[in-house]
């Protein structure tokens, strides 16, 4: 006869994991009983379980409520058991001894690979503004068993490092993805995938990029000065810029306080109908928690009465 | 040929204790399994409990968590704990035990001892 088994079973933690051992024998023999050992180099054989044709099944006060025989129907030839609820340390080498009439006794080995899938966390960096060197973005930590594979997927354009750390039993595995922040990052999805044979699929953790910058201010509202005239209502000023975070807008004039009856309305600051009194310097502050833009204009009021007495003037000394 | 001579049975109230021993002899080679096996008049023999050379533990499980099996490989002597008797644990007490042969291999014969009487009563 022969002993039947597998040279590795693989389960993920907290599974139970089946240790099969059927005897392959010629008709007439007998399995007088089927023992379990741990058997791993080193130490000497531990006995798990005993499976007797007569006494039934003997467990290992380490393993007790652990091991089971499979459910019936059971074959008289078959020496499999059930290891419930597998955990890391019970990885390693088992021996199965078949005690057999009359032919004698039979021992097989196997290795029992106990699977830890990861629980992957990700860390971002410190925060990203615009005109940094290369930035750490984000890290990605998993420890399991055998190591994972930490990759990132994302557009964005950045370099990884990693690094192992290897444990008793497990190993982690820590990715750092670094970038060169740009605004053209923002709200840019960076991904950490975990890859695990334990894992019936990756597991990934996104982090949504925040690069703090803000854009050069200009004011928009002076490009035809010949609107700027007395008496022409609605006209306004407007700054213009962006930022992350989204910045704040103030208006100044340079040249003294802002006249009566000018709003100001965020970024846009608003004319009542227009005097000379409005002629002056206006200044747009624009600040964020990253970084602060000025942009000042010259608002000049044409008065069309002393226009067409200059164009006199003009003609006249013409 | 191995002999099985058991000791410890006797009278007791419900909820005492008892200590059963046996010491199995005559045998140049190892002892396999050793346990007990009771039989109550007008009953079928049954299991009480085994324990293999190595360790391992075989209750049944109306005795579970009151009865406790060890075992001195040395001595070749195997000890039943018995505490929180009931009534129904009357019956006569055999030791029991199998071997390995010359060659290694596990003798097909089970043997047995004479049997020591317990008594559950008030």
């Known amino acids: 006869g022969e002993l039947e088994t597998s040279d590795v079973v693989t389960v993920v933690l907290g599974q139970d994991a089946k240790l099969p051992c059927f005897y392959r024998g010629d008709s007439g023999e007998q399995v007088g009983q089927v023992a379990w050992a741990r058997a791993d180099a080193g130490e000497g054989a531990q006995e798990l379980a005993l499976l007797h044709s007569k006494y039934g099944l003997h467990v290992s006060p380490a393993y007790e409520g652990r091991v089971e025989q499979p459910p019936p129907p059971r074959n008289p030839l078959d020496g499999s058991v059930l290891l419930r609820n597998a955990v890391q340390a019970d990885e390693g080498e088992y021996e199965c001894r078949v005690s057999t009439f009359p032919a004698g006794s039979f021992q097989a080995r196997l290795r029992l690979r106990v699977l830890v899938p990861p629980l992957p966390s990700l860390n971002p960096g410190p925060a990203l503004e615009e005109g940094q060197g290369l930035t750490l973005a984000a890290s990605c930590t998993a420890e399991g068993s055998p190591a994972p594979s930490v990759t990132w997927d994302t557009e964005v354009k950045g370099t990884t490092s990693s690094r192992s750390f290897k444990h008793s039993r497990s190993a982690a595995v820590t990715s750092e993805f670094h970038l060169v922040p740009s605004r053209s990052m923002n709200g840019q999805p960076l991904t950490c995938v975990v890859s695990h044979p334990g894992l019936l699929q990756d597991q990934r953790i996104t982090h949504i990029l925040h690069v703090s910058f803000l854009a050069e201010a200009s004011v928009r509202g002076l490009e035809d000065q010949n609107l700027w005239h007395v008496g022409r209502e609605g006209a306004m000023l407007k700054c213009l810029s962006e930022g992350q975070p989204p910045p704040s807008y103030n208006w100044t004039r340079l040249d003294g306080p802002l006249p009566s009856g000018v709003r100001v309305d965020g970024d846009t600051l608003g004319f009542p109908p227009l005097t000379t009194e409005h002629s002056g310097i206006y200044v747009c502050h624009v600040s964020n928690e990253f970084s602060s833009r000025d942009s000042q204009v010259t608002v000049d009021v044409l008065d069309p009465q002393e226009d067409s007495g200059k164009q006199v003037d003009l003609v006249s000394a013409s | 040929q191995v002999q099985l001579v058991e000791s410890g049975g006797g009278l007791v109230q419900p909820g005492g204790s008892l200590r059963l021993s046996c010491a199995a002899s005559?045998?140049?080679?190892?002892?396999?399994?050793m346990g007990w096996y009771r039989q109550a008049p007008g009953k079928q023999r049954e299991l009480v409990a085994t324990?293999?050379?190595?360790?391992?533990?075989n209750y049944a499980d109306s005795v579970k968590g009151r009865f406790t099996i060890s075992r001195d490989n040395a001595k070749n002597t195997v000890y039943l704990q018995m505490n929180s008797l009931k009534p129904e644990d009357t019956a006569v007490y055999y030791c029991?035990?199998?071997?390995?042969?010359?060659?290694?291999?596990?003798?097909?014969?089970?043997?047995w001892g004479q049997g020591t009487q317990v008594t559950v009563s008030s």
């Open positions: 029991t035990a199998d071997q390995f042969g010359p060659l290694g291999h596990l003798s097909p014969i089970i043997y």
């Open positions: 005559g045998s140049d080679f190892t002892i396999n399994v």
């Open positions: 324990v293999t050379s190595g360790g391992s533990l």
